[in-house]
Amino acid sequence: MSRSNRQKEYKCGDLVFAKMKGYPHWPARIDEMPEAAVKSTANKYQVFFFGTHETAFLGPKDLFPYEESKEKFGKPNKRKGFSEGLWEIENNPTVKASGYQSSQKKSCVEEPEPEPEAAEGDGDKKGNAEGSSDEEGKLVIDEPAKEKNEKGALKRRAGDLLEDSPKRPKEAENPEGEEKEAATLEVERPLPMEVEKNSTPSEPGSGRGPPQEEEEEEDEEEEATKEDAEAPGIRDHESL
């Protein structure tokens, strides 16, 4: 964006789009101010990602004011949690992880409310929140879809998030980040499939076919690799 963005200072509660390598600009909120005393996060803001309810530390160059940027970045995207995030930033901007509601704070001096899913410490570590890997503190970055036609199939919407015929076993996600009992580990999870627009909902495999992806978003998604250390910790619907 413009250079002026790099100089922008944010305060607690500010709504932004946050950019992490390999991911689209993500709706987020400034949760903590930079503290020069903490070397690892000096000049970085702790941001809370809407939709995934995860946190990361980002510098101002990767943050973009929400109101000014929503026309540019606020378009539906196939990444898991993105549309939920767009909805939350508009309708529930004070949401906290696990349903904790925060009040907008003027400064970050006060103790934050408990956030079981957000780990303290380095920016590349997070608690085992929705979308993060099973190994606590580490992030899994999803690989870009291998085929063009796979990409289109991944954007789905409410009412078409499950398939009639499960394709492969996968551990069910738990939005509360709780440990699962052994009995529930091998839950059949559907794999989204390509579908025609306007297919009859009752037909097997009918899903919400995606609107055309924009080239800009396609390119960004290609950047995502296993080596990306920082990301909102979200997965494509493929991982359903």
Partner: antibody
Amino acid sequence: QITLKQSGPGIVQPSQPVRLTCTFSGFSLSTSGIGVAWIRQPSGKGLEWLATIWWDDDNRYNPSLKSRLAVSKDTSNNQAFLNIITVETADTAIYYCAQIYDYAVGFAYWGQGTLVTVSS
Amino acid sequence: DIQMTQTTSSLSASLGDRVTISCRASQDISNYLNWYQQKPDGTVKLLIYYTSRLHSGVPSRFSGSGSGTDYSLTISNLEPDDIATYYCQQYGKLWTFGGGTKLEIK
């Protein structure tokens, strides 16, 4: 502030068509990701989802009612419509419309409901 | 079609009680579950979305949990204003509601 208000004919005769209108404010059905859902509730019974109209007209219907329902919209006047092609006495119910966002966020805001009575 | 079952159609509780309302899906719905409150006057409100997330303006005494096919809504400190019928709803494959649980004060 998001508000939705349903309106309809009140009483209608069996086998006649019915058109219900949902007039809303605070959002637009031309905005990517926005939809309006129609839900009904027969007296003393539970909620039943009927249909959803999305911003891009890729709509969804309850399979058991699909042949009798059609949804449409007038984005410039902030209205969504539910057409029941031929009503039956079993269609007597309170009809609600609700705003829905693209992915996982539920029927976020509801209208107050309008009663449709099918009677000869 | 995915069926949603709320086995308890009505329950009575005292003010201040902790109340849990359960809901079961006919198949794994991957946490794609919402809870709604319908007041006696017919007003319907979204309480919880995506199993456990509190909708804007909903008091924190409401919480949701569950996974796979079994889900629950908990009201931690029952207040007079909570007298209503509560519905679960899946949105993984189209949308279906549970039959509702009517909550009354003892």
